[in-house]
């Protein structure tokens, strides 16, 4: 029985050239988290946080992705192409997989502000 819920930063916007924090939080379950996968809209893996092995940032993103804070991910030097969906997937036992979705909009305008409100998708 999957009782947990994933809370995410929901829909966020950030400035081109700036950075943004992608955050997911798993709550309402006692399941063990063995790994968290971060994926981009085209399903390519950005990073993995394994409970035993720690962080692995995939080579294509090494220059622009920083691990943390916590199980989150920091995207740096944002470009317009970074606009899109991001997914966090929690591998847990005995519950299985939980998936959260974040939509990032990268804006040219200096008006863009990073909103870090938590939402349940």
């Amino acid at each position: 029985m999957m009782t947990g819920t994933i809370e995410t930063t929901g829909n966020i916007s950030a400035k081109k050239g700036g950075s943004v924090i992608l955050q997911c939080h798993l709550s309402s379950t006692m399941a063990q988290v063995t790994q968290v996968n971060w994926e981009q809209h085209d399903h390519s893996l950005l990073a993995i946080r394994n409970a035993e092995l720690g962080w692995h940032i995939y080579p294509a993103f090494k220059d622009r992705v920083a691990p943390g804070p916590g199980l989150g991910l920091t995207l740096q030097s944002l470009t317009m192409n970074d606009t899109g969906e991001y997914f966090c997937t929690y591998h847990t036992y005995p519950d299985g997989t939980y998936r959260g979705r974040i939509f990032l909009e990268v804006l040219e305008s200096s008006v863009a502000e990073h909103s870090a409100r938590f939402q349940i998708p």
Partner: antibody, heavy 119, light 107 residues
Framework: EVQLVESGGALVKPGGSLKLSCAAS????????MSWVRQTPEKRLEWVAT????????YYPDSVKGRFTISRDNAKNTLYLQMSSLRSEDTALYYC????????????WGQGTSVTVSS | DFQMTQTTSSLSASLGDRVTISCRSS??????LNWYQQKPDGTVKLLIY???RLHSGVPSRFSGSGSGTDYSLTISNLEREDIATYFC?????????FGGGTKLEIK
Amino acid sequence: EVQLVESGGALVKPGGSLKLSCAASGFTFSNYAMSWVRQTPEKRLEWVATISSGGSYTYYPDSVKGRFTISRDNAKNTLYLQMSSLRSEDTALYYCARWLLSLYAMDYWGQGTSVTVSS
Amino acid sequence: DFQMTQTTSSLSASLGDRVTISCRSSQDISNYLNWYQQKPDGTVKLLIYRTSRLHSGVPSRFSGSGSGTDYSLTISNLEREDIATYFCQQGKTPPYTFGGGTKLEIK
């Protein structure tokens, strides 16, 4: 080239014990979770156990929980399955497989070792 | 537990045919569906993971699709080396259950 070679299969009596081994090569063993999967005489596949890369986490289906123990020796690149209180329904071909959490799948399998539980 | 059902246990087709093998889960598995190929000698290989993603080294004639509870594996141009039994498996929630398999034979 990823290689997984199982051994230790045998004919055992009901209630008996057996330890299976799986020798891994061609990849950094300590970086991967590993699993045992069995194939029954009726050709059905059943997941039996999974162990995390460092061995801290082990997972089992209810059918084998408390009777089977998965373990690993990362220094020896070897995966184990200790089976006790064996039953006739444990008769199967036992495969070891690499469990890739980034794929949510078992990406490489061994050739299997046969376990027969019969009096 | 999630029950995985492959309604067709055996399938006969001719070389060059387009073959589709189906798999149904008892609950929504959110595309965490894998396909494995078992050759007559017992060798097992991962073909497709996460419903539609081809594992490395797998020929492009293999493809996967589906969502929710219904999934399928398609071989677009059947070759002799494709003669095998195909199993689906859900990777969403333990226990990681498999379908009963579909044995593919040549007509």
